[in-house]
């Protein structure tokens, strides 16, 4: 499979926290009552790791059927395995649910590689380690799939958290989060803390690993340090944002900022890599190569194909540069930057060399569909999807992997002019609505 492609991504199993929690640097007052504070029941409710996706436990139907569901901010369907499949431990059995309602409508979702198809219906859904509510939600019962479910993974479905505009078969199919907000008092906001391991996990370690937190309806102070900085959601389809500048070790890539957002830039928990438009990718890799030139690596490494290994504990993090993305701020002519470390963009891979090795794949890749800020970016930060205020917030994650010399950062403000010009306007044609 391609690296950094869209779902499905393999997931790990479950257990105790990865990485230590850092103390809060600031303790600002809540902006709105009930929107911030402690959400103890939701902390550590995700499992998995960056190369394999992150999943949450959900229940579907009456009596409740428990399933592990991949959290995906890059799609908008709630879809679950609903027929036997060699790679599934369990699946949704509609005939056993007294509350299932058939919508008598099919759905077909093709990916670049693979696809799933199924039958639409509704049923009662809840999240055991989430808000104490049950909602009636649309469910795509997957009856056939190809290269979607993954052997040895521990998830049976996907929770698309983006907007109705990109739901299949069309935008009339209300996404799960919209249903949740409409039917309950849960605020129209969720936040994600994805915790990358920073080191390869063997099967026994994965069983005892934690993936992070999905806080539904709020923001948990314990999950981040410093301040939250917000960037506007440009358009409510994907979680689209605008990147206004890119730096490698503080050196500006000096490209027309439209290139960074060609044809869009999105925040997507269902993609492994930081994916960049072709021109941007080439410029970024050239700059990263130059910064790390004391060591040379084969082309296959920079293509995300070959692994590079070092003797355990000797990975030369210091030779790899930090990468900063400047995002449009909430105030006119103001931006802020998020900075990731090689500990985020070099993805640990297990089971390829000996236990005396630490092996990594380069987790920045080329895209033909714009910038995708996948797990590689999100693992550095606590990310707030503030749908109510049409904005996305970033703060340094309390669980991000770093070393004694450098840490991920969210910093601002910076003066940046003409940021609106950085957005790319996708041509609208009559045919575009017909494309899958």
């Amino acid at each position: 499979t391609q690296h950094g492609i869209r779902l499905p991504l393999r997931s790990g199993l479950g257990g105790a926290p990865l990485g230590l929690r850092l103390p809060r640097e600031t303790d600002e007052e809540p902006e709105e009552p009930g929107r911030r504070g402690s959400f103890v029941e939701m902390v550590d409710n995700l499992r998995g790791k960056s190369g394999q996706g992150y999943y949450v436990e959900m229940t579907v139907g009456s009596p409740p059927q428990t399933l592990n569901i991949l959290v995906d901010t890059g799609s908008s369907n709630f879809a679950v395995g609903a027929a036997p499949h060699p790679f599934l431990h369990r699946y949704y059995q509609r005939q056993l649910s007294s509350t299932y309602r058939d919508l008598r409508k099919g759905v077909y979702v093709p990916y670049t590689q693979g696809k799933w198809e199924g039958e639409l219906g509704t049923d009662l859904v809840s999240i055991p380690h989430g808000p104490n509510v049950t909602v009636r939600a649309n469910i795509a019962a997957i009856t056939e799939s190809d290269k979607f479910f993954i052997n040895g993974s521990n998830w049976e479905g996907i929770l698309g958290l983006a907007y109705a505009e990109i739901a299949r078969p069309d935008d009339s199919l209300e996404p799960f989060f919209d249903s949740l907000v409409k039917q309950t008092h849960v605020p129209n906001l969720f936040s994600l803390q994805l915790c990358g391991a920073g080191f390869p996990l063997n099967q026994s370690e994965v069983l005892a690993s934690v993936g992070g937190s999905m806080i539904i309806g709020g923001i948990d102070h314990s999950l981040y340090t410093g301040s939250l900085w917000y960037t506007p959601i440009r358009r409510e389809w994907y979680y689209e944002v605008i990147i206004v500048r890119v730096e490698i070790n503080g050196q500006d890539l000096k490209m027309d900022c439209k290139e960074y957002n060609y044809d869009k830039s999105i925040v997507d928990s269902g993609t492994t890599n930081l994916r960049l438009p072709k021109k941007v990718f080439e410029a970024a890799v050239k700059s990263i190569k130059a910064a790390s030139s004391t060591e040379k690596f084969p082309d296959g490494f920079w293509l995300g194909e070959q692994l590079v290994c070092w003797q355990a504990g000797t990975t030369p993090w210091n030779i790899f540069p930090v990468i900063s993305l400047y995002l449009m701020g909430e105030v006119t002519n103001q931006s802020f930057r998020i900075t990731i470390l090689p500990q985020q963009y070099l993805r640990p891979v297990e089971d390829v060399a000996t236990s005396q090795d630490d092996c990594y794949k380069f987790a920045i890749s080329q895209s033909s569909t714009g910038t995708v800020m996948g797990a590689v970016i999100m693992e550095g930060f606590y990310v707030v999807f503030d749908r109510a205020r049409k904005r996305i917030g970033f703060a340094v994650s309390a669980c991000h992997v770093h070393d004694e010399f450098r840490t991920a950062a969210v910093e601002g403000p910076f003066v940046t002019l003409d940021m609106e010009d950085c957005g790319y306007n996708i041509p609208q044609t009559d045919e575009s609505t017909l494309m899958t």
Epitope: T294, G300, Q306
Partner: antibody
Framework: QLQLQESGPGLVKPSETLSLTCTVS??????????WGWIRQPPGKGLEWIGN???????YYNPSLKGRVTISVDTSKNQFSLKLSSVTAADTAVYYC????????????WGRGTLVTVSS | EIVLTQSPATLSLSPGERATLSCRAS??????LAWFQQKPGQAPRLLIY???NRATGIPARFSGSGSGTDFTLTISSLEPEDFAVYYC??????????FGGGTKVEIK
């Protein structure tokens, strides 16, 4: 054309340090296009990778050699060297130096090899 | 650890015959695989890289194929100088470290 030639003692006593040098002729060891490496082959057996070095001094070693190996480079002499400490009879082998080309991936040029016997 | 298994261990053939050598990886190595030829008393020589590309100066009778876990080196018509030991090596995990155990092609 570029050639590689190994040199060093053919006999080393157990527990001592094996030292070999590879001289590069017909080209520069400071080329940014190559790593340089050592591979060994015990008599009648297969090939075992020992380690690589870049002209900048960046090194990679086989973890199975458990810290006994050191590879260094001397760009002024167009040479790179191998030191293997605490040798035993199991380290008896033909030692080859080689160039890692084709985008740092493949050993595309080899020295003739030198037999090193570990014996008292 | 990725293990490369070569088969058969020995292949007994006559000049002019076709030789088919196999190299199987314990997990996918994509197309990052090389084949080497080694004659007695000589250093190995690179024949094929990236699974199917002939190295400089290698005759067209040598060809490589495969990707993922299964690879084949084919010598279309054996010449007397082709009787040697052949090794495969993966470089999916870098730096290149793992060699197969070798296949000896001997005169029948």
């Amino acid at each position: 054309q570029l050639q590689l030639q190994e040199s060093g003692p053919g006999l080393v006593k157990p527990s001592e340090t094996l030292s070999l040098t590879c001289t590069v002729s017909g080209g520069s060891i400071s080329s940014s296009s190559y790593y340089w490496g050592w591979i060994r082959q015990p008599p009648g057996k297969g090939l075992e990778w020992i380690g690589n070095i870049y002209y900048s001094g960046s090194t990679y070693y086989n973890p199975s050699l458990k810290g006994r190996v050191t590879i260094s480079v001397d760009t002024s002499k167009n040479q790179f060297s191998l030191k293997l400490s605490s040798v035993t009879a199991a380290d008896t082998a033909v030692y080859y130096c080689a160039r890692l080309g084709h985008g740092y991936n493949y050993f595309d040029l080899w020295g003739r090899g030198t037999l090193v016997t570990v014996s008292s | 650890e990725i293990v490369l298994t070569q088969s058969p261990a020995t292949l007994s053939l006559s000049p002019g015959e076709r030789a088919t050598l196999s190299c199987r990886a314990s997990q996918s190595v994509s197309s990052y695989l090389a084949w080497f030829q080694q004659k007695p008393g000589q250093a190995p020589r690179l024949l094929i890289y990236d699974a199917s590309n002939r190295a400089t100066g290698i005759p067209a009778r040598f060809s490589g194929s495969g990707s993922g876990t299964d690879f084949t080196l084919t010598i279309s018509s054996l010449e007397p100088e082709d009787f040697a030991v052949y090794y495969c090596q993966q470089v999916y995990v870098w730096p290149p470290r793992t060699f197969g155990g070798g296949t000896k092609v001997e005169i029948k």
